[in-house]
Interface confidence: low
């Protein structure tokens, strides 16, 4: 069956370059026109570029024209997107997409590859407790959590009690701070009565910086 | 370029409902219109092409219609698998233009948020920064307003919000709002409060603490 497998994404500084690849299988690559489409975090789909099956014609969205170059290598069954002079607004998941045999819509898509354009360097998070108190108790239920702050790039994973605690957990999507670093919170609601007896530990893993933190969260002692 | 406008941007519905999404083109595109479904973290999936032709393997509850500038995608009886974001795309001209998307979410019953406030930890204060977190837990619908007040003075521009995806079990949302200050600014003030307004609350709820007190 038709498969499009993408590679080449990653973190790059503004003004630098990156090359994305889209390796095709399951069809005669040289006969098909393939496009690039991108999706900025939390946003809609934006068409980026296309190259004809015979390589004679290339077409680009205004937003990337002059900076991005599309190419293909039929002997390797691979389509490329060379991205130069990258800008923060180019941060997106990039998809390659193949048209239907005789029609100009996208019947087959790659899995997507994330490109992050930022001047930030890889940095592990600081993990701070969100301690339960009378201000975070409501009707026999207490809330507690961890603030995972100032890391780059995405993602981090957060579990509670090494995965044993899943009920009542909310790990929020990360927000990008003005510093260019990410921050998120993970919270859990538990019975107030358990605070003195049960141990609550958030387990934070940031693979890009090889950072692992286990933070015990307990009521603030006064 | 041809511009595509989808409406609504969000649609709340229940399983079994008949739902309709509209897509308008800024100029006639004949029937050169495709519809795609996208789920979080996944690539889009083709549903419909040529405005009304169903892609192979797509259930017949998806119905496309329209020509010229007005198009609709109807799901005749919404199934659990159909909660997703839908995009229209014109392929009349070569800068393949997509609509901005329509998110079909589960229609829940009104639920007021539980509100909690967390002061900055001593560990964080040692680093020179103070983050105050306000948590709104398990509410519906998604629209909620959080206002920060410091010594009763309204704050703006120094907080960020994040909202979870809709919970698959109870259809609620949760929200965190983080007020970020320098340690020096934090220590200049005493009362920190977050005020929450939501359809499920008869009046705004305020949670607060006095800096330095338990």
């Amino acid at each position: 069956q038709v498969q499009l497998v993408q590679s080449g994404g990653g973190v790059v500084q503004p003004g630098r370059s990156l090359r994305l690849s889209c390796a095709a299988s399951g069809f005669t690559f040289s006969r098909y026109t393939i496009h690039w489409v991108r999706q900025a975090p939390g946003k809609g789909l934006e068409w980026v570029a296309v190259m004809s099956y015979n390589g004679n014609n290339k077409h680009y969205a205004d937003s990337v024209n002059g900076r991005f170059t599309i190419s293909r290598n039929d002997s390797k069954n691979t389509l490329y997107l060379n991205m130069n002079s990258l800008r923060p607004e180019d941060t997106a998941v990039y998809y390659c997409a193949r048209i239907r045999d005789t029609a100009m819509f996208f019947a087959h898509w790659g899995q997507g590859t994330l490109v992050t354009v930022s001047s930030a360097s890889t940095k592990g998070p600081s993990v701070f407790p969100l301690a339960p108190s009378s201000k975070s108790t409501s009707g026999g239920t207490a809330a507690l959590g961890c603030l995972v702050k100032d890391y780059f790039p995405e993602p981090v994973t957060v579990s509670w009690n090494s995965g044993a605690l899943t009920s009542g957990v909310h790990t929020f999507p990360a927000v990008l701070q003005s510093s260019g670093l990410y921050s998120l919170s993970s919270v859990v609601t538990v019975p107030s009565s358990s605070l003195g007896t049960q141990t609550y530990i958030c387990n934070v893993n940031h693979k890009p910086s090889n950072t692992k933190v286990d933070k015990k969260v307990e009521p603030k002692s006064c | 370029d041809i511009q595509m406008t989808q409406s609504p941007s969000t649609l709340s519905a229940s399983v079994g409902d008949r739902v309709t999404i509209t897509c308008r083109a800024s100029q006639s595109i004949n029937t050169w219109l495709a519809w795609y479904q996208q789920k979080p973290g996944k690539a889009p999936k083709l549903l419909m092409y040529k405005a009304s032709s169903l892609e192979s393997g797509v259930p017949s509850r998806f119905i496309g219609s329209g020509s010229g500038t007005e198009f609709t995608l109807t799901i005749s009886s919404l199934q659990p698998d159909d909660f997703a974001t839908y995009y229209c795309q014109q392929y009349n001209s070569d800068s393949k233009m997509f609509g901005q998307g329509t998110k079909v979410e589960v229609k829940g019953t009104v639920a007021a948020p539980s509100v909690f406030i967390f002061p900055p930890s001593d560990e964080q204060l040692k680093s020179g920064t103070a983050s105050v977190v306000c948590l709104l837990n398990n509410f519906y619908p998604r629209e909620a307003k959080v206002q920060w007040k410091v010594d009763n003075a309204l704050q703006s521009g120094n907080s960020q919000e994040s909202v979870t995806e809709q919970d698959s079990k109870d259809s609620t949302y949760s929200l965190s709002s983080t007020l970020t200050l320098s340690k020096a600014d934090y220590e200049k003030h005493k009362v920190y409060a977050c005020e929450v307004t939501h359809q499920g609350l008869s009046s705004p709820v305020t949670k607060s603490f006095n800096r330095g007190e338990c």
């Epitope: 098909y32 015979n54 014609n57 005789t102 029609a103 100009m104 | 001209s93 070569d94």
Partner: nanobody, 112 residues
Framework: QVQLQESGGGLVQAGGSLRLSCAAS????????MAWFRQAPGKEREFVAR????????EYADSVKGRFTISKDNAKNTVYLQMDSLKPEDAAVYYC?????WGQGTQVTVSS
């Protein structure tokens, strides 16, 4: 203003062939989808075939599939419609279109 000029129409016996050409006045069309439409007397204009800007992707009305072939020569700013196995019901004025632009049309008559 882009000018599109069709040629190649005429009278042909049923079962015969014709090749229509549509020349554009500039390179506008080389980066746009090109299409052929037709309009028979007393009927609405209908889609016949289209080719994407690269020439790499084509689409046909069911009524002409397997008989008509659309192609494009970007170097010559020209799109072609090769019409084989013509039927009386193919008789119409044939128009080419690019983006918002239309040609003047060329008459195709098929005698039985």
């Amino acid at each position: 203003q882009v000018q599109l000029q069709e040629s190649g129409g005429g009278l042909v016996q049923a079962g015969g062939s014709l090749r229509l050409s549509c020349a554009a006045s500039d390179r506008y069309f080389s980066s746009h989808t090109m299409a052929w439409f037709r309009q028979a007397p007393g009927k609405e204009r209908e889609f016949v075939a289209r080719v994407d800007w690269s020439g790499g992707s084509t689409e046909y009305a069911d009524s002409v599939k397997g008989r008509f072939t659309i192609s494009k020569d970007n170097a010559k700013n020209t799109v072609y419609l090769q019409m084989d196995s013509l039927k009386p019901e193919d008789a119409a004025v044939y128009y080419c279109a690019a983006g918002p632009y239309w040609g003047q049309g060329t008459q195709v008559t098929v005698s039985s």
